[in-house]
């Protein structure tokens, strides 16, 4: 098993990248002198206790920043949040920490990230751009849930 996080860069089909702005991840068109975040990801080591056919369960963080993506309900609405957390602390926990886990599915060059805590809810960006990343149940409508993930070695 790999027990160090892998690093990657992400953009959506409109070539927008993820940028950290005031502790919030937003998707913006790539420009010069811009610093897109580098993603840190690591597979859950308790994969045998999670559903088999939804994708690879991963923890998603921001490389070098001790910030991880998590899903939590605000009222009745699952929301995407950044929490100060060491991704390896999550990896080493005795059980899957579902609020921080995403099923990573790949189809060709496209990746989707589905919340383990809230099945059917996916990381998404508004088609308008310049907006925060969100969770959505509505695939392929006003929001983009397909991303290109390029691993950095």
């Amino acid at each position: 098993k790999i027990d160090t996080p892998q690093r990657g860069s992400i953009q959506d089909i409109n070539h927008r990248v993820w940028v950290l702005q005031d502790q919030t991840l937003i998707a913006v068109p790539r420009k010069d002198r811009m610093s897109p975040v580098t993603i840190a990801l690591i597979s859950c080591r308790h994969v045998e206790t999670l559903e088999k056919d939804r994708g690879n369960p991963i923890y998603l963080g921001l490389n070098g920043l001790n910030l991880c993506l998590m899903c939590a309900k605000v009222g009745d609405q699952p929301t995407l949040q950044l929490k100060e957390k060491d991704i390896m602390d999550l990896y080493n926990q005795p059980e899957p920490v579902k609020s921080f886990l995403f099923y990573h599915s790949q189809s060709g060059r496209n990746s989707t990230f589905e919340s383990v805590a809230f099945p059917g809810w996916f990381i998404a960006v508004s088609s308008e751009g310049g907006c925060p990343l969100i969770l959505t149940q509505e695939l392929g409508k006003a929001n983009t849930t397909d991303f290109g993930l390029t691993m950095l070695f």
Epitope: T49, L50, E51, K85, D89, Q93, P94, E95, V97, A117
Partner: antibody, heavy 121, light 109 residues
Framework: EVQLQQSGAELVEPGASVKLSCTAS????????INWVKQRPEQGLEWIGR????????RYAPKFQGKATITSDTSSNTAYLQLSSLTSEDAAVYSC??????????????WGQGTTLTVSS | QAVVTQESALTTSPGETVTLTCRSS?????????ANWVQEKPDHLFTGLIG???NRAPGVPARFSGSLIGDKAALTITGAQTEDEAIYFC?????????FGGGTKLTVL
């Protein structure tokens, strides 16, 4: 208010099976891991295993593989512990507990009141 | 399977500091054992106190703290109160299962 309500005391004959229940109120069992532990007088606690009610996946302590079966029914918000081929060694109090993640750790936080199992002919 | 050992009984006085320990038969207890501490009062009333070696569960009084002391996990009660009289169990994680100790009966006289 969060509560785990366990089924009542059982008197069962050796060789038989028994199914104990643990019904949650105040939260959805799909949002936690439900654990079962065994307690005999002067013998401490023994962890039997756990279930993730969201998907039905279980883990067991090596000693209880084949002896215990943990299941759940999310429609009734209930977890079950079935014990088979009962002997006097299985006579004990059995308790259910939630295992929840807060902030940075998992905790055995909420507990049922225990079910006393007596094995006797 | 690993064996987890605790003091069978300890006695303290109100206001005193007392430390309960938890030893593993497999070697030193480390943060990878995610030590949990649970309190049992009469009639099988259990309360989770500590998780992940040193993190207090929500609502647990600050006088309870968890740590590693030498090769053991420890629960320290700073300024014990009469209501802390109970049995205290530790649980250690071993790769894919938990093992509980035999419990420490704490008397506060």
């Amino acid at each position: 208010e969060v509560q785990l309500q366990q089924s009542g005391a059982e008197l069962v004959e050796p060789g038989a099976s028994v199914k104990l229940s643990c019904t949650a109120s105040g939260f959805n069992i799909k949002d936690t891991y439900i654990n079962w532990v065994k307690q005999r007088p002067e013998q401490g606690l023994e962890w039997i295993g756990r279930i993730d009610p969201a998907n039905g996946y279980t883990r067991y302590a090596p000693k209880f593989q084949g002896k215990a079966t943990i299941t759940s029914d999310t429609s009734s918000n209930t977890a079950y512990l079935q014990l088979s081929s009962l002997t006097s060694e299985d006579a004990a109090v059995y308790s259910c507990s939630t295992l929840n993640y807060y902030g940075s750790s998992f905790f055995f936080d909420f507990w049922g009141q225990g079910t006393t199992l007596t094995v006797s002919s | 399977q690993a064996v987890v050992t605790q003091e069978s009984a300890l006695t303290t006085s109100p206001g005193e500091t007392v430390t309960l320990t938890c030893r593993s038969s497999t070697g030193a207890v480390t943060t990878s054992n995610y030590a949990n501490w649970v309190q049992e009062k009469p009639d099988h009333l259990f309360t989770g106190l500590i998780g992940g070696t040193n993190n207090r569960a929500p609502g647990v009084p600050a006088r309870f703290s968890g740590s590693l002391i030498g090769d053991k996990a420890a629960l320290t009660i700073t300024g014990a109160q009469t209501e802390d009289e109970a049995i205290y169990f530790c649980a250690l994680w071993y790769s894919n299962h938990w093992v509980f100790g035999g419990g420490t009966k704490l008397t506060v006289l």
